[in-house]
């Protein structure tokens, strides 16, 4: 029987700014039962607090709701793990809110065909910003990435759509049934999670471009 | 105890291509960006650029972009920083360096001198 | 790219004395998100840089006390109440509110 392993606060998420999670990863337990407690401090603070919030963000996770959650202000953090025999710190972790965003997917995605008598066909795309970001404060850039496939492919082609929400694809095989999916990040942030598939079936006369090529 | 431990000194070429390294330990690789910055002799200090390990998203410095190559190799927690076509202005100690969930940098790698010369 | 001016180039200080450090920035730090992303950095002789200060005037962890950082907008400083041997080196500030991150020129200082 020995004192708790050292724990490791490994990942902080926001949807959003206004709230956030830290999760930390348990040491070994010293084969005894082990309590854990995380504790932080705000930058120009020297007032230690206790970790408001240990359900919300499920085992070993610590949740900040609304009124503990201040973007301009640094946290600093650490998490004590306490068994019979003794305890171990965490390494201090700082955390910046606007450096761990993980926005919500973007929403309503709409797929067309668009074949414009005087040019080649194109897929059209567009989608809105996830409800939850607040892109008018300037405080988020979100960049957005397309994925595609026909049904029954097993490989996803990728683009890069930066900061547009629109999108046009050239090249696409005639009579396919295609999957189109965005996600979002802000700069800094993390990737969302893939919007729900929308499927879009590409007509038998659709001309297929020599080069394979999209235009934003 | 978090460890950057960078790869050992390299002589190259001009047009020549370098790749150096960044072993990290002592936490979770994939959770914090890793930055690449470079110190010229009796020089300041530039920055490179960033990537997130978790998913290889990058972001450059204009004056880099095109030249410089990062990437990670996530199974060894390893960060590469690749530079082509040397010229002996590129002659500087690099140095990685890993942030926390911030944009400012706590951990240095080492460094690792790169000479370029002919 | 945001330019970072320090002055001055070097520093020689008699230990026990304050030592003073400013940095000017070619545009404002203050970030879109209201923060100020300055920080100072040290680099002893032979030595990767550590870091002193981060955003603007918060002490790292196991900085001592005697090393504050103040400023706003474009002007910042870095004090040293009381010069100790262990302190020589090059000192760095660095701003990371815009991209390409940037550094400061660097200020030596040293021990008279």
């Known amino acids: 029987q020995l004192p708790p392993g050292k724990p490791e606060i490994f990942k902080c998420r926001s949807p959003n700014k206004e709230t956030f999670t830290c999760w930390w990863r348990p040491g070994t337990d010293g084969g005894l039962p082990t309590n854990y407690s995380l504790t932080y401090h705000r930058e120009g603070e020297t007032l230690m607090h206790e970790c408001p919030d240990y359900i919300t963000g499920g085992p070993n996770s610590c949740h900040f709701g609304k009124q503990y959650t201040s973007m301009w202000r640094t946290y600093v953090m650490m998490v004590n793990a306490t068994n019979q025999m003794g305890s171990s710190f965490s390494d201090e972790l700082y955390v910046d809110v606007t450096y761990i965003v993980q926005p919500d997917p973007p929403l309503e995605l709409t797929v067309e065909v668009k074949q414009p008598e005087d040019r080649k066909p194109y897929l059209w795309m567009k989608w809105s910003p996830p409800t939850l970001i607040d892109l008018k404060t300037g405080w988020f850039t979100l960049l957005y990435e397309i994925r595609l496939k026909p049904e029954k492919a097993a490989e996803w082609e990728t683009h890069f759509a930066g900061q547009q929400t629109e999108f046009k694809i050239l090249s696409l095989h005639p009579g396919q049934k295609y999957l189109v999916q965005v996600r979002c990040k802000p700069d800094h942030g993390y990737w969302s999670a893939w919007s729900p598939a929308t499927f879009i079936q590409i007509p038998s006369d659709f001309i297929m471009n020599d080069h394979h090529h999209h235009h934003h | 105890e978090v460890q950057l431990v960078q790869s050992g000194a390299e002589v190259k070429k001009p047009g020549s291509s370098v790749k150096v390294s960044c072993k990290a330990s002592?936490?979770?690789?994939?959770?914090?960006?890793i930055h690449w910055v470079r110190q010229a002799p009796g020089q300041g200090l530039e920055w490179i650029g960033e990537?997130?390990?978790?998913?290889?998203?990058?972001n450059y410095n204009q004056k880099f972009k095109g030249r410089a190559t990062l990437t990670v190799d996530r199974s060894s927690s390893t960060a590469y920083m690749e530079l082509s076509s040397l010229r002996s202005e590129d002659t500087a100690v690099y140095y990685c360096?890993?942030?926390?969930?911030?944009?400012?940098?706590?951990?240095w790698g080492q460094g690792t001198l790169v000479t370029v010369s002919s | 790219d945001v330019v970072m001016t320090q002055t001055p180039l070097s520093l020689s200080v008699t230990p026990g004395q304050p030592a003073s450090i400013s940095c000017r920035s070619s545009q404002s730090l203050v970030h879109s998100n209201g923060n100020t992303y300055l920080h100072w950095y040290l680099q002893k002789p032979g030595q990767s840089p550590q870091l002193l200060i981060y955003?603007?005037?918060n002490r790292f962890s196991g900085v001592p006390d005697r090393f504050s950082g103040s400023g706003s907008g474009t002007d910042f400083t870095l004090k040293i109440s009381r010069v100790e041997a262990e302190d020589v080196g090059v000192y760095f500030c660095s701003q990371s509110t815009h991209v390409p991150f940037t550094f400061g020129g660097g200020t030596k200082v040293e021990i008279k």
């Open positions: 002592g936490y979770t690789f994939t959770s914090y960006w």
């Open positions: 990537i997130d390990p978790s998913d290889s998203y990058t």
């Open positions: 360096g890993r942030s926390f969930f911030t944009n400012w940098f706590a951990y």
């Open positions: 955003k603007v005037s």
